[in-house]
Structure formats: C-alpha cells, structure tokens
Amino acid sequence: GPLEVEPPDSVVAVSMGGSRQLTCRLSCADHRAPSVQWRGLDTSLGAVRSDAGSSVLSVHNASLSAAGTHVCVGSCGNLTLQRTVQLLVFAFPDQLTVSPVALVAKQDREVACTAHNVTPASPEALSLSLLLGDRELGEALSREVEEEPQQGEDLLFQVTGRWLLPSLDTPTPPALHCRATMTLPGVQLSHQRAIPVLRSLTSREPPGTTSPEATPELSSTRSSESPAPPAGNSSARPCRPKIHQSPAAGGLELLCEAACGPGVAVGWTQAPGGLEAYQRREAGAQAWLSVPRAGCGPEGWFQCRLDPGGQMASLYLVAEVCSPPAPP
C-alpha cells in the first residue's frame, strides 16, 4: 500500500509552544514486515516512536528552531517510498492592543491596532483589519512591523495597522473591532478586540469597566495547536531605537532615533537593495534615510542599530501600487 502520513498535508503549521504529532504508516502487500522511519534533514527530529509499520514524530513545546523538513522513509523489501513534510512554527498569541483604548465620537479620527509577539509578520500570513459593525474598513493608512525585544532565541514581531475613521456621529455608533488573522497552510486563526466608542469626553473608560477587555474570537481549520503561552514582560528593558516614518517630497523620510541619554548613536544597517541606494544623514542619536517612491518604491526591511548595545529596530515597507515612470 501507499505510504500514509497523518496529517496528510505537505506543510504542517504548529504554534510556538504548542505540540504536534506526525504519524507515518506503511503496510506491505506480501506480508513482509515494513520498515518506516522519520528523518530530519535540516532540523532536530524531536521524539520519534517507531514500531512495525508506523513511526510517530512528536514535537512538544515547539520553538522556531523546530521548523524544518521531515522525511518519512518507508520500505517493503527493495521498494522504498518517501513523503516530505515541512513543519512551520508560527507565533500568534492573543495579544492585541488598540490605541486609543476607547474612541470619542466626533473627536478621534485615527485608530491603531497592534498584534504583539507574532511571526510570520508579512501581509500574506498576518492580516489586520478594522470592522465597523460587520463592515470591514478599507486599506490601512499604514502597516508597520517592528521586532519585539528579544526573549530567548525566537525573533518575534509587533505589527501595527492604522486607519482613518469615518464619522461616528450617529445616535448609536456601530461596534468597532480590530481583528488579526493568521493564515498559513492548514491554519486560519483570528483574534478580535473591541474598541468602545464613547458619546462624549467625560471619561476615557466606558462605564462599569476598568479597561476594554480583549474579546478573542478563535476559529481554526484543520489545526490542533496548544495555545502559545503569553510572552513574559520584562520590566527593565534596554533602551531601544525606534523608526518613525513621515511623508517627504517624492517619497518617505525614515527617522531612527533613540532617547537613551548622552553617549549613544544610531545608524542605518540595512535597506532593500543596499544602503548605498539611499540618501542618509546621521547625527548622534538620530539617523535619517530618504526613501524614494518612484515606480513601485522599494519593498523590504529597513533596519537601524544602536551603539553601544547593538539593539536593533526594523521596519518592513510594502511597495505601493506602481506609478508608471514619469515621461522623459
């Protein structure tokens, strides 16, 4: 018979800190004893339990380093069969924050929503949306990706979307929610957070609450992850640089700065296509970089670094819809 793998997908995604089992089975037609084993080509295998005709690979407390290519090799006599499974490890804890925590009708026009401690952070996997009632507001004004302060070997990100709100000046403003969705092969997970809309500026908190609670709405297809534990907050975090963007003639200006007191400097260390393609200016704790928006504009990671200390800040810019090159 064929070599059977459960789950049958060629890509299996597991949440960070979660567990997953991959089972490989083979039966031989001629009553010969089959041989089945898992091999990790580029990763440590985890725990493997094999007996005649089956092999079970168990991944517990998955970290990003558990990701990789696993091959199940089965044989019946001289016939050898193989199946490859790519294990992905993602992080998507229920850690959504919104700013402001409550909106004042007629006054607040912009809202930001941030998903914390996630990976991957690219738009194809992680989408952020703002829901007004059951209607999704259009494209975000901007999307920013920054590295979280590193805790252990796993590099995680915070992704922030910003939206401009329509007028909320109706007798009963519709409910406002921020939703984050992680989509990977075999996995679709969503978290949602309500943003209270206040009628007037008497209080920033809705009556009867201390702070708006997250309202997770978890839906998953073909996934059996254990939820990842929330990342611990470290109180004494080192001083970190931050990247700000502002529009400039013909493009964007990025400012990397660190408010860490005297004796520190920041500098740009990475940009799509190489730093030499950009105009830069550095002055102690501030460094500027000009991003032209000709054609599609650059797409990729901009990174700056703090010295001394080596802390990094990163920003991922998505290329905008292409404007055709200006006529000569």
Epitope: A121, F157, P185
Partner: antibody
Framework: QVQLQESGPGLVKPSETLSLTCTVS????????WSWIRQPAGKGLEWIGR???????NSNPSLRGRVTILADTSKNQFSLKLSSVTAADTAVYYC??????????????????WGQGTLVTVSS | DIVMTQSPDSLAVSLGERATINCKSS????????????LAWYQQKPRQPPKLLIY???IREYGVPDRFSGSGSGTDFTLTISSLQAEDVAVYFC??????????FGGGTKVEIK
C-alpha cells in the same frame, strides 16, 4: 508522488495576455504555496510570482502590474496571466511547488517539485 | 534585489574528477539569529526542469547522491561534485531565499565532460 503539469497556448501575439494553467496531483494546492518561474532559451531562471494559502499573491517587482496568479481549488489548479507581452516574454514557463520557511517574519521559499515546462513564444 | 552571480559560466571536468561551481550574492544571505544560510542549488539537465539538490547552503535533498555537497556562508558559496559522473552533465543554478520579493537565481554554470 507530487506532479505538476503546465498547459496553455504555445504562441501569443505581442500586446496580448499570456495564459497558462498548472494542474497539481499528489498534493492539495490549498495546503501549500505555488510559484511560476520562467527561463528564456539558453538563459537563467526568473521567478515570476506565487500564490499562497489565503489566495493572495507575491510577484516579481520587475513584472508588477502585469502578473495575475489565481487558484481553482476545486480543480487543484493554479494559473498565470501575464498581460501586455512582448518578444522578451518568450520563454519556457514552469510551475513549481514552494518549500516555505519563516525568516525575519517573512515567508521565503525554494522549490522542490517542478512541472516539465511549456514553451511560450510571443510573435505576430 | 539580491543579485546572484555564478562562476564560471561553463566548466569541463574529466570523469571521476572534482567539479567546483561558485556562487556569490550581492548581500549576505546568512541570518545570524539562527545561523542559517538561505541558499539553494539546482541541477537542470537538457530539456528537463530544474531539480532541487541542496538547501540551507549545505543540506542535501533526500535522494541526492552524496558526491554533491554545498558549502559557504554569508556571500560566497560553492557546489562541489566530488567525482563527476556522466549523468552529472547539466547546468547548475544557485538561488537565494533570504529576501522576497523577488526570489532570485544565479545565471547558471554548465558542467561538461572533458
């Protein structure tokens, strides 16, 4: 065994749209990422773009605006449309399965299964 | 874009001898956080599609003969065929997958028998 097979017209007129389909067997297109790659005669390989689980796409910025990649999960197929073609688009077009990984929050890939390729000539 | 440059363009080696192909990236494809190098090698025989040989710069794809090996880190990489066989006559390509979009390939190196 995973198999991919490209199909579509071998001849396209300049300024028209090139359309190709890739039929996949041995794997579900909804459980992976899938790419189109092309190779002009005697030249190197150029990644065109890919489609992924959520139905979204990435494409090569050098072709941006001309590339559309769609999936039909009911037929286990994905397709490529390349608009406004010129003679420079003459090439063997391959579909391939991405082996994806996660790095720096991105999802790059290399290619572990390829179709046999189909030659598309752009000529009037 | 990360530009991948291969050398030489072609190479003639006697059967049983060592063949060495080089690939250089315009920026580092080594990710220091996990110490992985995001580079793959492919073999393309005449009238066939490319076949994956090596990824992470040095991991052989399952079923690839052990005479093929990959090495290098950062920006300079090498594919070595330790003892060339007749069936190894092909064009070999490197590919970076550190940065997307786009994923980029080298121009190819043609290996022939001397």
């Amino acid at each position: 065994q995973v198999q991919l097979q490209e199909s579509g017209p071998g001849l396209v007129k300049p300024s028209e749209t090139l359309s190709l389909t890739c039929t996949v067997s041995g794997d579900s297109i909804s459980s992976n990422y899938w790419s189109w790659i092309r190779q002009p005669a005697g030249k190197g390989l150029e990644w065109i773009g890919r489609i992924y689980t959520s139905g979204g796409t990435n494409s090569n910025p050098s072709l941006r605006g001309r590339v559309t990649i769609l999936a039909d999960t009911s037929k286990n197929q994905f397709s490529l449309k390349l608009s406004s073609v010129t003679a420079a688009d003459t090439a063997v077009y391959y579909c391939a399965r991405d082996r994806i990984t996660i790095i720096r929050g991105l999802i790059p890939s290399f290619f572990d299964y390829w179709g046999q390729g189909t030659l598309v000539t752009v000529s009037s | 874009d990360i530009v991948m440059t291969q050398s030489p363009d072609s190479l003639a080696v006697s059967l049983g001898e060592r063949a060495t192909i080089n690939c250089k990236s315009s920026q580092s494809v080594l990710y220091s956080s996990n110490n992985k190098t995001y580079l793959a090698w492919y073999q393309q025989k005449p009238r066939q599609p490319p076949k994956l040989l090596i990824y992470w710069a040095s991991i052989r794809e399952y079923g690839v003969p052990d005479r093929f090996s990959g090495s290098g880190s950062g920006t300079d990489f090498t594919l070595t065929i330790s003892s060339l066989q007749a069936e190894d006559v092909a064009v070999y390509f490197c590919q970076q997958y550190y940065s997307i979009p786009p994923l980029t390939f080298g121009g190819g190196t043609k290996v022939e028998i001397k």
